[in-house]
Interface confidence: low
Amino acid sequence: SVTGEGQGPRSRTFTCLTNNILRIDCHWSAPELGQGSSPWLLFTSNQAPGGTHKCILRGSECTVVLPPEAVLVPSDNFTITFHHCMSGREQVSLVDPEYLPRRHVKLDPPSDLQSNISSGHCILTWSISPALEPMTTLLSYELAFKKQEEAWEQAQHRDHIVGVTWLILEAFELDPGFIHEARLRVQMATLEDDVVEEERYTGQWSEWSQPVCFQAPQRQGPLIPPWGWP
């Protein structure tokens, strides 16, 4: 009988988030490992032959950029191991035996947010990565908009924007004559309970997009008759 060597408790924790395309960003909290040690995470694919990807930690972060042929798919499944050298010997720890990227999604923010002012409303349009276009219907957006001089904490929000890459802000939602700013973020939509597990994505909101500035359109209200009209 052999007693296992306890390698814990481990005070480090790892968080790895994917943009659901070709990038996995990892962040860790750990005691200093000392000079000369270059720790890394190793992602070993359970799906693809040759699917081993090294993530060299610089400070508390590392990023894996997958080759184009390894674009992430819902069935992807990795084992993550943590490697570092101590006293000239490599130490290996198991981080996650079953890392499912689709359960740890943080998408890149929408890009190319633009405004188009028409009489009575403003049309906002934006772009997503071409790699995400097949899952357009799974993307949920949140819009924040405000007067330019206001802080983002005071912004109005519109959420549950699903499956589209444009929306209309009506003039009555804006303050006429003022310059406004809008920004957008995206996440994988929360699906109904009857969706099969293999198609279920979870994660967090992306960072906010670069804001777009626009002049609020004039309101097209009904003409108000002068006093005294019958």
Partner: nanobody, 117 residues
């Protein structure tokens, strides 16, 4: 504390088979994953195969199609069936148990597997 009992290592001819076993006992109520790593002389310790509590398995590319990891949850035992072994499979094989959340992990002392050509 977790106790690990490894068995099954030894000398085998290239093309032959071996079955490694690792039984865990002790504070095993929170075991998340069990698996095998190996370390050949002068080389880094590497993942061979791992199996999660849910039964999902992961095998290193170098052993896919030849080695199979399995687990008997009732016995808290993990197995590594090694078929069509090659001289480059010669290494010390270590059993690994990791608890849920990755707070603790335990390693066996290792069992030697030698493949002769």
């Amino acid at each position: 504390q977790v106790q690990l009992q490894e068995s099954g290592g030894g000398l085998v001819q290239a093309g032959g088979s071996l079955r490694l076993s690792c039984a865990a006992s002790g504070s095993i109520f929170s075991i998340n994953a069990m698996g095998w790593f190996r370390q050949a002389p002068g080389k880094q310790r590497e993942l061979v195969a791992v199996i999660s509590s849910g039964g999902s398995t992961n095998h290193a590319d170098s052993v896919k199609g030849r080695f199979t990891i399995s687990r008997d949850n009732a016995k808290n035992t993990v197995y590594l069936q090694m078929n069509s072994v090659k001289p480059e499979d010669t290494a010390v094989y270590y059993c690994l148990v990791a608890t849920r959340g990755g707070t603790y992990e335990y390693w066996g002392q290792g069992t030697q597997v030698t493949v002769s050509s």
